[in-house]
Interface confidence: medium
């Protein structure tokens, strides 16, 4: 018995071939011997089966001795053995119809779980293998779960249902809702304007929700909410903002925040959360601010950084075009009695300069000591 696999909602064509290459009488019946369709001369006749309005044939092929049964908009319950009677012969075809659906929304937050459910006919024992857009293969039976979705899981999932060494393929488009970056770090000199950007890794027609930026300054004992905002159809409106610092926010996506000036008391880490309408859970992006200050007080030239720096970062003071005078894996370095000239304070990671601040040291004219 020939086995044909079909997909719920699709169209299937079951073949039936006569030895004579001409139009002769044929009938298609189901396993209960109920007539589905057949012919009377060159006319298509239909029987009382439940497939009535969804069953068809190709009359253009009858003259070649081919009498297909076409079933449109397949349902799981269409799974059955179909019998083609032609030339006193019976050809049996077993049709198995499968459906695969994501049993939640196909737009999921990063970190959430995706569950795919297979609808299958009674008596079948299929297996499912799915390949994610990043090339991860997973397998299961009637249900298939993927926990902790990542950004790279966005895209078309290709799932293959295997039964009787035959396969049918499903494509399911999954959108993982997340920020493009989980974390970012901004390096600024004291007094410079700071731009924070929070681009989303997905696009949807309408985007509605609300968000907040909580900030933990390095110098502060607790975190505080710097800004809260609403998002309506991709338009951003500020609800509440602190007076110090007074952040400004762009009115359009991507989410964009401006801090008028970088000051040591603002250096620290922030967490932007975005709650989307009709979604449980929130999107998160961490943002870090490192601020540098170079100062000269009397005979002491000092360079300091504030904020979340990694222990491997190097802070250096050097006279322009000369070797570093001092270089340490610390957050403050200084030089006593610095030579006159343009001094550079550098924050670097494995030789790559992340932040630079210049300060001019003027010559000191000392009066000779009287004898």
């Amino acid at each position: 018995k020939k086995v044909v696999l079909g997909k719920k909602g699709d169209t299937v064509e079951l073949t039936c071939t006569a030895s004579q290459k001409k139009s002769i009488q044929f009938h298609w019946k189901n396993s209960n011997q109920i007539k589905i369709l057949g012919n009377q001369g060159s006319f298509l006749t239909k029987g009382p089966s439940k497939l009535n309005d969804r069953a068809d044939s190709r009359r253009s092929l009858w003259d070649q001795g081919n009498f297909p049964l076409i079933i449109k908009n397949l349902k799981i319950e269409d799974s059955d053995t179909y019998i083609c009677e032609v030339e006193d012969q019976k050809e049996e075809v077993q049709l198995l119809v499968f459906g695969l659906t994501a049993n939640s929304d196909t737009h999921l937050l990063q970190g959430q779980s995706l569950t795919l459910t297979l609808e299958s006919p009674p008596g079948s024992s299929p297996s499912v293998q799915c390949r994610s857009p990043r090339g991860k293969n997973i397998q299961g039976g009637k249900t298939l779960s993927v926990s902790q979705l990542e950004l790279q899981d966005s895209g078309t999932w290709t799932c293959t249902v295997l039964q009787n060494q035959k396969k049918v393929e499903f494509k399911i488009d999954i959108v993982v809702l997340a920020f493009q970056k989980a974390s970012s770090i901004v390096y600024k000199k004291e007094g410079e304007q700071v731009e924070f950007s929070f681009p989303l890794a997905f696009t949807v027609e309408k985007l509605t929700g609300s968000g907040e930026l909580w900030w933990q300054a390095e110098r502060a004992s607790s975190s505080k909410s710097w800004i809260t905002f609403d998002l309506k159809n991709k338009e951003v409106s500020v609800k509440r903002v602190t007076q110090d610092p007074k952040l400004q926010m762009g009115k359009k996506l991507p989410l964009h925040l401006t801090l008028p000036q970088a000051l040591p008391q603002y250096a620290g880490s922030g967490n932007l959360t975005l709650a989307l309408e009709a979604k449980t859970g929130k999107l998160h992006q961490e943002v870090n601010l490192v601020v540098m200050r170079a100062t000269q007080l009397q005979k002491n030239l000092t360079c300091e950084v504030w904020g979340p720096t990694s222990p491997k970062l190097m802070l250096s003071l050097k006279l322009e075009n000369k070797e570093a005078k001092v270089s340490k894996r610390e957050k403050a370095v200084w030089v006593l009695n610095p030579e006159a000239g343009m001094w550079q304070c550098l924050l670097s990671d494995s030789g790559q300069v992340l932040l630079e601040s210049n300060i001019k040291v003027l010559p000191t004219w000392s009066t000779p000591v009287q004898p």
Epitope: R131, P133, N137, I138, Q165, K166, K167, E169
Partner: antibody, heavy 118, light 108 residues
Framework: EVQLVESGGGLVQPGGSLRLSCAAS????????MHWVRQATGKGLEWVST???????YYPGSVKGRFTISRKNAKNSLYLQMISLRAGDTAVYYC????????????WGQGTTVTVSS | EIVLTQSPGTLSLSPGERATLSCRAS???????LAWYQQKPGQAPRLLIY???SRATGIPDRFSGSGSGTDFTLTISRLEPEDFAVYYC?????????FGPGTKVDIK
């Protein structure tokens, strides 16, 4: 008879480009995942790329952004477009068919040699 | 990336002896996604085992595969002269679909 025949190999300078082809016969090409695998002289097998029946593509980091796998089901053909070639890409390139209902490369071509040298 | 380690690097045996080849994965691989290949000099590889333990079409029953998780084994029950070759394991669990470095089975 199920068969895969690779072509398009040759000598190319570093930074150059090459397009490999694989002609398939004896089976319904569109029903199968297809792969490219390479092997440098005296070395082991290295997976280069895969294209699924739905057109989904996969690459290792070593070739991502430089190599592009594609297929033309109507022509029963598989392709590998290679740009920005390096000496390390020198190898015999095999085209292979993925299993029908299992994972494994069950039919292989005889390979085509790519040499990247100035 | 899942790294596959094969041991031993070389296995020196005589015809008629039993060969046991190991393939270890750096992280768990579902048995459905592990394959073994044989390659002889100047030839393309040949699929021996898929799904960790199923023999490919036309492969003699002296070849068998076993294992799960991170440890997989290819066994050749009685070596025939034509079995002396290099054997590779490969995982399809997640991209990149890596191969092991190979085990060479040569004549003692």
């Amino acid at each position: 008879e199920v068969q895969l025949v690779e072509s398009g190999g040759g000598l190319v300078q570093p930074g150059g480009s090459l397009r490999l082809s694989c002609a398939a016969s004896g089976f319904t090409f569109s029903n199968y995942d297809m792969h490219w695998v390479r092997q440098a002289t005296g070395k082991g097998l290295e997976w280069v790329s895969t294209i699924g029946t739905a057109g989904d593509t996969y690459y290792p980091g070593s070739v991502k952004g430089r190599f592009t796998i594609s297929r033309k089901n109507a022509k029963n053909s598989l392709y590998l477009q290679m740009i920005s070639l390096r000496a390390g890409d020198t190898a015999v390139y095999y085209c292979a068919r993925g299993g029908d209902y299992y994972y494994g490369m069950d039919v292989w071509g005889q390979g085509t040699t790519v040499t990247v040298s100035s | 990336e899942i790294v596959l380690t094969q041991s031993p690097g070389t296995l020196s045996l005589s015809p008629g002896e039993r060969a046991t080849l190991s393939c270890r994965a750096s992280q768990s691989v579902s048995s459905s996604y592990l394959a073994w290949y044989q390659q002889k000099p100047g030839q393309a590889p040949r699929l021996l085992i898929y799904g960790a333990s199923s023999r490919a079409t036309g492969i003699p029953d002296r070849f068998s595969g076993s294992g799960s998780g991170t440890d997989f084994t290819l066994t050749i029950s009685r070596l025939e002269p034509e079995d002396f070759a290099v054997y590779y394991c490969q995982q399809f669990g997640s991209s990149p679909f890596t191969f092991g470095p190979g085990t060479k089975v040569d004549i003692k």
